[in-house]
């Protein structure tokens, strides 16, 4: 039978009638209303947009559209009393100040409420001192510091370029080696790309532009005080002091004219090598310290941003399923900005709103889905995803029995070459057969389809033929729903041709600068990428939500988890010795995968027999299918970090934006011959392999045939 | 008793690629239970493992060399080779060619090794 014919609608409501109700003039205007004012997280503004979007989603056709409001911790500059950093002589003044705010955009002068560059969390301080310069503050940069430069950044303040690492990564990278402060700036040689010229002029970052930002580690805890649970009206929170994620040393953001200002004074040691200079002109010293004539000046931040716990407001809509109204697709993407939201996240949220829409026109001529679609637009993504973390937690129960697929739905944008996909493997072959539908917008592939530039754009390095899908990280709202619950995930954006920056941002990201203009003067004026992503987008909703059988296919998951078993084995495999000391083996593992590749085989075979029309069979194969993703999850965690519950992926431990496989394995095997006590460390190792081999065993058996 | 043997050139030129073969005698190479593997030991350093091969031709490699390394298995000669490409005077070192048991670093034979130098 097909969709249509499952919920007893007419052949006309198909994919086709939702994509082609989808209009690129439509998601250009509602980006432009998004983004008139500031939508920060916790403001007035955010609340009134919030109240609009539901009162148009329900105009739109929704069932129902809710507010869901929560009481969490937020972080503001102090309005009286900016941050600034300066260099202070040996009398103690200021000689240099950094500048309070970014020069607005052309137009925007007089807009109020826009709030100056700060690190969201910092705490408040005012420490003095040396400066070092510690490249992107990744965890292979302090082994350079370190171990090879043996430069010592205890008491020290270090600068540390933008880029390559989640923000927050680098602030407990510098806490970990002593630092007393840190100040993160936006280098030209990651933030400005060659032969474009800067804001209002092209989409390069001006010299006075600055990437806002919070740096907590929370780990997926959601609301730093109210972790594993929701905060609501009745929630006990714990006291600052044991609060999940704050950093312990100021941090502040600058641009790179005030980031030149300090480096060019810069001594001590020069740089290690040429991957640690970036483009300005400016030796790139490490330090510590000014050199010769300045040797005596010193670095003071000047921090006030206070903690508070403020009201949030997510906005939840939902379209009711015909046939399986308890299982649960949920398109969400977030609605505060930092400033303006031009790309982050309005380009999203005007992608919903298009989507929204669509499905709204659809059911008004009668159709429903066959499940229920719920849709959301998340607040305080920027503070920690905790919007939708909240809500997560609070409706957890319902989710992990219900809940099929989450699809988010960030910036739609962050450059306009081809398509970029992260997503679960069951969902490959659902983008793959979608892809192939759809028309690419890509200059130079009129009449092709989309899966044909981005296979060409953006291929495979492991299957030709193929595109590129990366696997899922964090950094954005799909956290708690991947990584703590289980529930199948994806995101889909057009990017850059840029891979070497994957995780740097494009250059005006959580600046002032990033306006409607940006989007509809440089990035996309025909808006028709933003189409693209929302066909994109919305194609895997529709199917998720109306396909007979659910469009996962579990053979992939097979073939990723054997990748992912080589290339860890690899790595346990360059300490040979000490694999053989502690008769270490990955036996169990590999054992592991062969049997979930034999059971996924099987599993796939009944899949393509089994009578469709027999509800209960049908629902019971589906089910097998939906809580696959979820039989991969370990209700303990992962070590030190409970909310990351995923056995096969979790953000990096070194980087929150980029995912990692086998985790646990991983961050066991990192640095392992450094470690005091060798015989514990590889325990830890034989342990995770344990685990990760039972895990991949426990989920085949829930693809075998139930009795 | 099963024997392996390493057998290439002692001198490579930089930038050029380094091949070695290892012929297995004693025993067939066509088992699922053993992997056959390089590793190598630079002067004055510890071991280093390169890399291995199933029978069917199946690979692992060092993460640190997978660009540079190509390992590949001939079971009707019952030998497995190495290539290692764009080499420095850093690939210097004694190259040996073990079995060992699959999943596992359990290297319970190997050849008596050979000195390749990397020079000019």
């Known amino acids: 039978k097909s969709s249509n014919e499952a919920t007893n609608i007419t052949p006309k409501h198909n994919m086709k009638a939702f994509l082609d109700e989808l209009k690129a003039e439509n998601i250009k205007k509602f980006l432009y209303n998004f983004t008139q004012i500031p939508h920060l997280a916790g403001t007035e503004q955010n609340f009134q947009l919030a109240k609009q979007i539901q009162s148009q989603w329900k105009e739109f056709g929704l069932d129902s559209v809710e507010l869901a409001h929560y009481d969490v911790l937020l972080s503001y500059p102090n309005k009286t009393h900016p941050n600034y950093i300066s260099i202070i002589n040996e009398d103690g003044n200021e000689i240099f100040n950094t500048s309070l705010f970014e020069p607005p955009p052309p137009g925007y002068e007089n807009v109020s409420d826009i709030v100056p560059p700060f690190s969201a969390f910092s705490p408040q301080g005012m420490p003095e001192g040396d400066l070092v310069y510690v490249n992107y503050a990744r965890t292979e940069d302090f082994f350079k510091l370190e171990r090879d430069m043996k430069i010592n950044c205890s008491g020290k303040i270090v600068i540390a370029r933008y880029g390559k690492v989640f923000r927050g990564n680098k602030v407990k990278n510098a806490q970990l080696a002593g630092a007393k402060g840190v100040i993160l700036y936006s280098d030209p040689a990651d933030y400005f790309a060659p032969g474009v010229k800067s804001y209002p002029d092209g989409w390069n970052l001006p010299g006075g532009g600055v990437q806002r930002g919070n740096i907590l580690n929370l780990n997926g805890a959601g609301d730093p005080l109210t972790p594993g649970y929701p905060a609501n009206e009745y929630a006990y929170r714990r006291g600052i002091a044991e609060a999940v994620g704050l950093p312990s040393i100021p941090v502040h953001p600058i641009g790179y004219y005030d980031a030149q200002k300090l480096l060019e004074k810069m001594g001590g040691s020069a740089p290690p090598d040429s991957s640690w200079r970036g483009s300005l002109k400016v030796p790139y010293n490490v330090g510590p310290g000014f050199t010769g004539n300045f040797s005596t000046q010193k670095v003071k931040m000047h921090i006030h941003s206070t903690n508070e716990v403020t009201r949030i407001y997510n906005v939840i809509g939902t379209l009711r399923g015909a046939v399986e109204p308890d299982r649960y697709v949920i398109l969400g993407g977030h609605r505060d900005s930092w400033v303006f939201g031009g790309i982050d996240p309005q380009s999203g949220a005007a992608v919903v709103h298009e989507i929204v829409r669509s499905f709204g026109t659809l059911k008004k001529e009668g159709w429903r889905p066959r499940r229920t679609i719920l849709f959301a637009s998340w607040d305080a993504e920027e503070f920690g995803l905790l919007g939708s973390t909240e809500w997560a937690e609070e409706n957890s129960r319902l989710l992990q029995e219900r809940g099929v697929a989450y699809i988010n739905a960030d910036s739609s944008i962050e450059g306009n070459y081809t398509l970029r996909v992260d997503c679960t493997p069951l969902m490959y072959s659902l983008v793959h057969n979608l892809t192939k539908e759809l028309k690419s917008p890509d200059e130079g592939f009129e009449g092709k389809s989309l899966y044909e530039s981005w296979t060409k754009k953006s291929p495979s390095p492991e299957f030709s033929g193929m595109p590129r899908i990366s696997k899922l990280g964090s950094g954005n709202d799909f956290e708690v729903f991947f990584q703590r619950l289980g529930i199948a995930s994806g995101r889909a954006r057009y990017t850059k041709n840029w891979e070497t920056n994957k995780f740097s941002g494009y250059p005006l990201y959580h600046s002032v600068y990033e306006t409607y203009e940006l989007v509809e003067k440089f990035y996309d004026p025909m808006f028709k990428y933003h189409l693209t992503v929302a066909q994109v987008r919305g194609g895997m909703v529709f199917e998720l939500a109306n396909s007979i059988v659910l469009p996962f296919d579990c053979r992939d998951y097979a073939v990723v988890l054997r990748k992912y078993a080589d290339k860890i084995y690899s790595i346990s495999m360059k300490h040979p010795q000490e694999m053989k000391t502690y008769s270490v083996s990955f036996d169990s593992l590999f054992s592991a995968v062969k049997n979930f590749t034999e059971i996924a085989s099987k599993f796939s075979e009944r899949l393509q027999d089994f009578d469709k029309s027999n509800p209960i069979v049908l629902r019971m194969m589906n089910d097998q299918l939906m809580f696959l993703e979820r039989a991969f999850i370990d209700p303990l965690g992962l070590p030190d970090r409970p909310f990351y519950r995923h056995v096969i992926y979790a953000p990096s431990s070194h980087n929150k934006y980029a995912g990692e496989s086998f985790p646990g394995i991983y961050d066991a095997l990192f640095d392992i011959e450094s470690k005091v006590d060798p015989s514990k460390a590889w325990g830890e190792v034989k342990r995770q392999i344990y685990v990760a081999a039972f895990t991949v065993q426990a989920a085949a058996e829930t693809l075998s045939e139930v009795a | 008793q099963l024997q392996l043997q390493e057998s290439g050139p002692g001198l490579v030129k930089p930038s050029e690629t380094l091949s070695l073969t290892c012929t297995v005698s004693?025993?067939?190479?066509?088992?699922?239970?053993y992997y056959w593997g390089w590793i190598r030991q630079p002067p004055g350093k510890g071991l280093e493992w390169i890399?291995?091969?199933?029978?069917?031709?199946?690979?692992y490699y060092n993460p640190s060399l997978q660009s540079r390394v190509t390992i590949s298995v001939d079971t009707s000669k019952n030998q497995f080779s190495l290539k290692l490409s764009s080499v420095t005077a850093a690939d210097t070192a004694v190259y040996n060619c073990?079995?060992?048991?699959?999943?596992?670093?359990?290297?319970?034979?190997r050849g008596q090794g050979t000195l390749v130098t990397v020079s000019s």
């Open positions: 073990a079995r060992h048991k699959a999943a596992t670093a359990d290297f319970d034979y």
């Open positions: 004693g025993g067939s190479i066509s088992s699922s239970s």
């Open positions: 890399g291995s091969v199933d029978y069917s031709g199946y690979t």
